[in-house]
């Protein structure tokens, strides 16, 4: 499947998952905490202030690094999965902290967490990597 299609699908699924999570957690627009979001790379569930959210490396890095083997499980398609099963010390895990000022930036940044061989596809069709 073309990367554009993968990510349109991922984004749509993300928005659905966020909506379900908001209902489960009793979140609304005026709730304190951090709203769920699609950051154009992966999906982040809503979180309370002080909560750290962990995610597995997104699909994008399976395109960038087709030979990469991930040690962590992929978060389920129907919900956000059990992020307690993920550990920041694992390769392939990215976190964001929910603070009073909103979400922190990813830690580590995606390339550091998910691995990236910048020379592997140097001559490849760069348009293939556009998301939209």
């Amino acid at each position: 499947m073309h990367s554009d299609c993968i990510f349109k699908k991922e984004q749509a699924m993300c928005l659905e998952k966020i909506q379900r999570a908001n209902e489960l957690m009793g979140f609304n627009d005026s709730s304190p905490g951090c709203p769920g979001m699609w950051d154009n790379i992966t999906c982040w569930k809503p979180a309370h202030v002080g909560e750290m959210v962990l995610v597995s490396c997104p699909e994008l890095f399976r395109i960038f690094n087709p030979d990469q083997v991930w040690e962590t499980e992929t978060i389920g398609e129907s919900d956000f999965g059990d992020s307690n099963s993920l550990d920041l010390s694992d390769m392939g895990v990215v976190s964001r902290n929910c603070t009073e000022d909103g979400w922190s930036e990813p830690f580590p940044h995606y390339f550091d967490a998910c691995g990236f061989d910048e020379y592997e596809s140097e001559t490849g069709d760069q348009d293939y990597y556009y998301l939209s």
Epitope: D39, N40, I41, L60, F64, N97, T99, D101, S104, E105, P106, F107, P108, H109, Y110, F111, D112, F116, E118, S121, E122, Q126, Y129, Y130, L131, S132
Partner: antibody
Amino acid sequence: QVQLVESGGGVVQPGRSLRLSCAASGFTFSRFAMHWVRQAPGKGLEWVAVISFDGGNKYYAESVKGRFTISRDNSKNTLYLQMNSLRAEDTALFYCARGYDVLTGYPDYWGQGTLVTVSS
Amino acid sequence: EIVLTQSPATLSLSPGERATLSCRASQSVGRSLHWYQQKPGQAPRLLIKYASQSLSGIPARFSGSGSGTDFTLTISSLEPEDFAVYYCHQSSRLPFTFGPGTKVDIK
């Protein structure tokens, strides 16, 4: 090897506009976030803006928000900074830098900079 | 925004001495703190990423430590080429910020 070459700097009057360019080579430009960082003469570094690998995410320092626009053309391996309503305090050496990430990242390779002087 | 404070502003030392540079954040940045070296007339160079991770091509005498709000860059034994300005940078929260720098000069 990674190469970043800035251009477009010069002397401009307050209130006018200027567009900086940064030509990238030696890496797959379309996969990396890119930053602009500036340095006023004799002063420290000031982060200005960042753009994600596909241009979908753009973030700015408060001091330039609403006046500067970061953009990129991945088909030309070029990063841009459109600067409007320039002020004397914008006088600085402007560096473009590669962000080691798809989204934002930290600058890992830097160009040599292009000097912008805002003066009447 | 997160304000980074570096101390001292200037550090006067002799070659062979140990240099200890400090960077303090106004709020926690976790480990998303990076160190750069800048020599006169040159672009900055990344020295340490994520507070303590070394980079290939950077001499082993450069090391970093810390997390949260307090960070340290240590140069174990100063070489003549190490006299420069050192900046810390946080990529934990937007807008990203740099510290004001510490100048390491020859005593």
